[in-house]
């Protein structure tokens, strides 16, 4: 028995920030639970870790290079990146795994999100003409 | 709720070896991380290695690179700390840390838990 995950296709980061919302087809309201962020289409890098537990406060993991935050819905997970680099643009999988109570429960592989981070465009600035001869 | 038991702490003159070991019991997930921290007297607790489970990723502590080496046995959820030419500085109290971020992390706010700490000892 594995739970479905929905992502959107793809989200643009204008302003280096994006909001990622991960959905399951679960409930985690008092589970203890590990839901986390993956980047590359082989999911190589784990950049982000929710913690949740019945118990605690959420915890919230960003490996270094990443700012991220964690926000916990009944059945949604939202991962808050900010100060992306356009060079993180890439593929973004949600991953899930519920640990208690039992049985043990992850997720099937979802379709990822694409995260478009778009480079900030600053204007050149005017141009002024210098002194003007009499 | 993770409990996390050490040993192989003692002494040993500077030049020697000591392994510690650091076993995890509890519920655990596909991916988390271990790592070694140490505290000497009148010191804050620094990071010297660690190690995560996932997959194989290692990070070490500048003073430490080339002389200390991280391992794991995960069907035994245990992690290895094999120390080699020791010197009277690396003298402190090892902690065993856990944490739920999948790679292995030097920031000490990153651990949930920790082991209760062994002692090592380098003196002539």
């Known amino acids: 028995n594995k739970i479905l995950v929905k992502q959107s296709p793809m989200l643009v980061a204008y302003d280096n920030a994006v909001n990622l919302s991960c959905k399951y087809s679960y409930n985690l309201f008092s589970r203890e639970f590990r839901a986390s962020l993956h980047k590359g289409l082989d999911s190589a890098v784990e950049v982000c870790v929710v913690y949740g537990n019945y118990s605690q406060q959420l915890q919230v993991y960003s490996k270094t290079g990443f700012n991220c935050d964690g926000k916990l819905g009944n059945e949604s997970v939202t991962f808050y990146l900010q100060n992306l680099y356009v060079n993180q643009t890439d593929i973004y999988f949600c991953k899930i795994e519920v640990m208690y109570p039992p049985p043990y429960l992850d997720n099937e592989k979802s379709n990822g999100t694409i995260i478009h981070v778009k480079g900030k465009h600053l204007c050149p600035s005017p141009l002024f003409p210098g002194p003007s001869k009499p | 709720e993770v409990q996390l038991v050490e040993s192989g702490g003692g002494e040993v003159q500077p030049g020697g070896s000591l392994r510690l070991s650091c076993a995890a019991s509890g519920r655990m997930f596909s991916n988390y991380a271990m790592g070694w921290f140490r505290q000497a007297p009148g010191k804050e607790r620094e990071f010297v290695a660690a190690i995560n489970y996932g997959r194989d990723d290692a990070d070490y502590a500048e003073s430490v690179k080339g002389r200390f080496t991280i391992s794991r046995d995960n069907a035994k959820n245990t992690v290895y700390l094999q120390m080699s030419s020791l010197r009277a500085e690396d003298t402190a109290v090892y902690y065993c840390?856990?944490?739920?971020?999948?790679?292995?992390?030097?920031?000490?706010?990153?651990?949930?838990?920790w082991g209760q700490g062994t002692l090592v000892t380098v003196k002539p």
């Open positions: 840390g856990f944490t739920y971020a999948g790679w292995a992390s030097s920031r000490r706010d990153d651990y949930n838990y």
